[in-house]
């Protein structure tokens, strides 16, 4: 269960693959695409707005966190529309909706080395977002091994990683070498 | 389907002013960025001014900047240009334009301008 | 200001395929759209994002980018392409088009 219905924190962050391809977002009123390549030098970089929850789980599942508790986040590109996991097509799919969002919209968050996160399926333990022929898909990570693994890592930049201590405590970070890499920074948008 | 109707347009004297009117219609007027664009008699297109999500997110190009602005009235799914301080070379169609995709947080007009309205015409003349 | 240069004009013949160029500076560091105007009609977006087309925009329509010229270019050209083509692009919030160049099939 989610701990509260209101987010932690929010803050807007524009969001790149592990090779540094930008993630484009375009939509339209009865379709989308999700466009991962590399952007264009004078093109400016969409941004998604990132809450942050706090979760209760069995301490003996993964994710950033101790005694049990895990940062969950969701992700919107824009105003009422929020990335799902399609866990039956393996896929990642945008979809319109009112609060309460659904279990699909929620992803484990993972700080991952060099300064990079992966996001997990909640509805899906084991199951990442990833990046596969050029789109966002779901990809199932069989080991811990693997949980570093390139098509998984996403970068988030025009953030300052340090904002995750006041969320969570630099102390609950498992890596120390990570702590030295993340400086989240807050943003506020209004809508 | 998408249609955006121009109105407002019409005769006006040097100095005079107009308001334009764009009644849109067939998507969520609200998530899509918008724009005028003009075309004066014989020439080719001239972005005028565009509008994001709210009225701090105004753009202008340069020859109309402090008589012309544009607003937007979600409510009404509206998009208008006030234009004032008329001068001749303002005569054109102009049209409303609705940018492809729908707005990002990352702010501003999203290009490429995926619909256009059948325009209405501007005539400055004494 | 940012400028696009256009040919004021372009011929060929049906069946032929046309080439219409957009000139800017550093214009591969942007994306080009490309709009289709007939005569006593709305522009139509024809090519989006470089290389991309809308739907209802048949196949013959193809576009490129790179280094400072963007290009429409336009394989087996019917008698109904005929029209007027504009590029254009977004430069730091601000619509940026050519002068536009007057398409006629032969």
């Known amino acids: 269960s989610i701990t509260g219905i209101s987010p932690i924190t929010e803050y807007l962050a524009s969001l790149s693959t592990y090779n540094d391809q930008s993630i484009t977002f375009a939509l339209e009123d009865e379709s989308y695409e999700i466009y991962v390549e590399d952007l264009k030098k004078d093109e400016k970089k969409d941004k998604v707005l990132l809450s942050y929850y706090e979760s209760q789980h069995p301490s003996n599942e993964s994710g950033d966190g101790v005694d049990g508790k895990m940062l969950m986040v969701t992700l919107s590109p824009t105003k009422d529309f929020w990335l799902h996991a399609n866990n039956k097509e393996h896929s990642v799919e945008l979809h319109k909706c009112e609060k309460p969002l659904p279990d699909q919209a929620f992803f484990v968050l993972h700080n991952m080395h060099s300064n990079c996160v992966s996001f997990e399926c909640k509805t899906d333990p084991g199951v990442f977002i990833g990046v596969k022929d050029n789109h966002l898909a779901l990809i199932k990570v069989d080991s811990s091994e693997n949980l570093c693994t390139e098509n998984i890592l996403f970068k988030l930049s025009e953030t300052n990683p340090a904002f995750l201590y006041k969320v969570v405590g630099a102390a609950d970070y498992k890596d120390d070498d990570d702590k030295a890499a993340h400086h989240h920074h807050h943003h506020h948008h209004h809508h | 389907e998408v249609q955006l109707l121009e109105s407002g347009g019409g005769l006006v004297q040097p100095g005079g002013s107009l308001r334009l009117s764009c009644a849109a219609s067939?998507?969520?007027?609200?998530?899509?960025?918008m724009s005028w664009v003009r075309q004066a008699p014989g020439k080719g297109l001239e972005w005028v001014s565009g509008?994001?999500?709210?009225?701090?997110?105004?753009y202008y190009a340069d020859p109309v900047k402090g008589r012309f602005t544009i607003s937007r009235d979600n409510s009404k799914n509206t998009l208008y240009l006030q234009m004032n301080s008329l001068r001749a070379e303002d005569t054109a169609v102009y049209y409303c334009?609705?940018?492809?995709?729908?707005?990002?947080?990352?702010?501003?007009?999203?290009?490429?301008?995926?619909?256009w309205g059948q325009g209405t015409m501007v005539t400055v003349s004494s | 200001s940012y400028v696009l240069t256009q040919p004021p004009s372009v011929s060929v013949s049906p069946g032929q395929t046309a080439s219409i160029t957009c000139s800017g500076e550093r214009m591969g560091d942007k994306y080009a759209a490309w709009y289709q105007q007939k005569p006593g009609q709305s522009p139509v977006l024809v090519i989006y994002?470089?290389?991309k087309r809308p739907s209802g925009i048949p196949e013959r329509f193809s576009g490129s980018n790179s280094g400072n010229t963007a290009t429409l270019t336009i394989s087996g050209t019917q008698a109904m392409d005929e029209a007027d083509y504009y590029c254009g692009v977004l430069k730091q919030d601000t619509g940026v088009f050519g002068g536009g160049t007057k398409l006629t099939v032969l």
């Open positions: 067939g998507f969520t007027f609200s998530s899509y960025a």
């Open positions: 509008i994001a999500d709210d009225f701090t997110s105004t």
């Open positions: 994002r470089d290389t």
């Open positions: 334009a609705r940018d492809l995709w729908m707005m990002n947080y990352a702010g501003g007009l999203r290009y490429p301008f995926g619909y």
